[in-house]
């Protein structure tokens, strides 16, 4: 059974992940057309099911494409000082949270998502898990 300290650690990690994802989303939401129009042509794959920490495997698999988008669409109004570091930090948190005991084959939904929908989906996931922990 998880101890209160491990639960607290998980909660902190989720909150950190949540803040990182929200920071990216806020930056993108500040983009003006036609830049936003261009960014929305990037497609992301969504999990069929995301209710447990192990489902973070699906986020991990899409981090490379996310990094690519953020690098390509760097902006003077929203400049992530080091996209590589940010994605690397997210990756470290995701790996710790999902654990490595079980290697899950991610099942993706048939529909793809824009970067905005993708980030919102994983933000909702973090919020949902945090609420069950608190």
């Amino acid at each position: 059974a998880p101890t209160s300290s491990s639960t607290k650690k998980t909660q902190l990690q989720l909150e950190h992940l949540l803040l990182d994802l929200q920071m990216i989303l806020n930056g993108i939401n500040n983009y003006k057309n036609p830049k936003l129009t261009r960014m929305l042509t990037f497609k992301f794959y969504m999990p069929k099911k995301a209710t447990e920490l192990r489902h973070l495997q699906c986020l991990e698999e899409e981090l490379k494409p996310l990094e690519e988008v953020l690098n390509l669409a760097q902006s003077k109004s929203f400049h992530l000082r080091d996209t590589k570091d940010l994605i690397s930090n997210i990756n470290v948190i995701v790996l710790e949270l999902k654990g490595s005991e079980t290697t899950l084959m991610c099942e993706y939904a048939d529909e793809t998502a824009t970067i905005v929908e993708f980030l919102n989906r994983w933000i909702t996931f973090c919020q949902s898990i945090i609420s069950t922990l608190t």
């Epitope: 003006k32 036609p34 960014m39 042509t41 497609k43 494409p65 003077k76 529909e111």
Partner: antibody, heavy 121, light 113 residues
């Protein structure tokens, strides 16, 4: 090796239907937009539009909207260009080309060999 | 639609000599916010499909010799070949991808004198 292989040359009569194909290999076919480009005899290149095989999202250039249909079968890594009723003016070479994860942010870095379509009565 | 205009229509060249092709767009291809210029150059050799030479104004595509270079700003662009080789003959096209629909220039035919 990353490549796009197109179906063979076609000779058709006006009013007939046609579907040509473009099969990708050596990369994650579903993750890249596939553009279609027309080249009429002795003329330049025209971008017809693009399809994302991962979800079959299509974007048509206004000049080609309603004239052609793009489709894709991701299970066999193949994109298609089709006409329901060919006209003599459809006579051209048609190329498919890989357009990256976004057709705005990437050039067309891999091209099919082209499919010649001849429409004549 | 953005109109892309190339000059000259035809360019006779001497092997070993430099050559340059111009391309002009009817509106700016520069996104000043992100600093990208959404212009590519393609070469179509006789009897072959086009191939990507230069993307995003000045980046050489994989396997493209360094004698090819792209430059320009806003609406005026140039493709330069520092020393033309016999294998460089064909039709060169510029293409914009800042705005839908993507559009090509009419092409410049490069041939050996």
């Amino acid at each position: 090796e990353v490549q796009l292989v197109q179906s063979g040359a076609e000779v058709k009569k006006p009013g007939e239907s046609l579907k040509i194909s473009c099969k990708g290999s050596g990369y994650g076919f579903t993750n890249y937009w596939i553009g279609w480009v027309r080249q009429m005899p002795g003329k330049g290149l025209e971008w017809m539009g693009t399809i994302y095989p991962g979800d079959s999202d299509t974007r048509y250039s206004p000049s080609f909207q309603g004239q052609v249909t793009f489709s894709a079968d991701k299970s066999i890594s193949t994109a298609y260009l089709q006409w329901s009723s060919l006209k003599a003016s459809d006579t051209a070479m048609y190329y498919c080309a890989r357009q990256g994860r976004s057709y705005y942010y990437f050039g067309m870095d891999v091209w099919g060999q082209g499919t010649t379509v001849t429409v004549s009565s | 639609d953005i109109v892309m205009t190339q000059t000259p229509l035809s360019l006779p060249v001497t092997p070993g000599e430099p050559a340059s092709i111009s391309c002009r767009s009817s509106q700016s291809l520069l996104d000043s916010d992100e600093g990208n210029t959404f212009l590519d150059w393609y070469l179509q050799k006789p009897g072959q499909p086009p191939q990507l030479l230069i993307y995003t104004l000045s980046y050489r595509a994989s396997g493209v010799p360094d004698r090819f270079s792209g430059s320009g700003s806003g609406t005026d662009f140039t493709l330069k070949i520092s020393r033309v080789e016999a294998e460089d003959v064909g039709v060169y096209y510029c293409m914009q991808r800042i705005e839908f629909p993507l559009t090509f220039g009419g092409g410049t035919k490069v041939e050996i004198k």
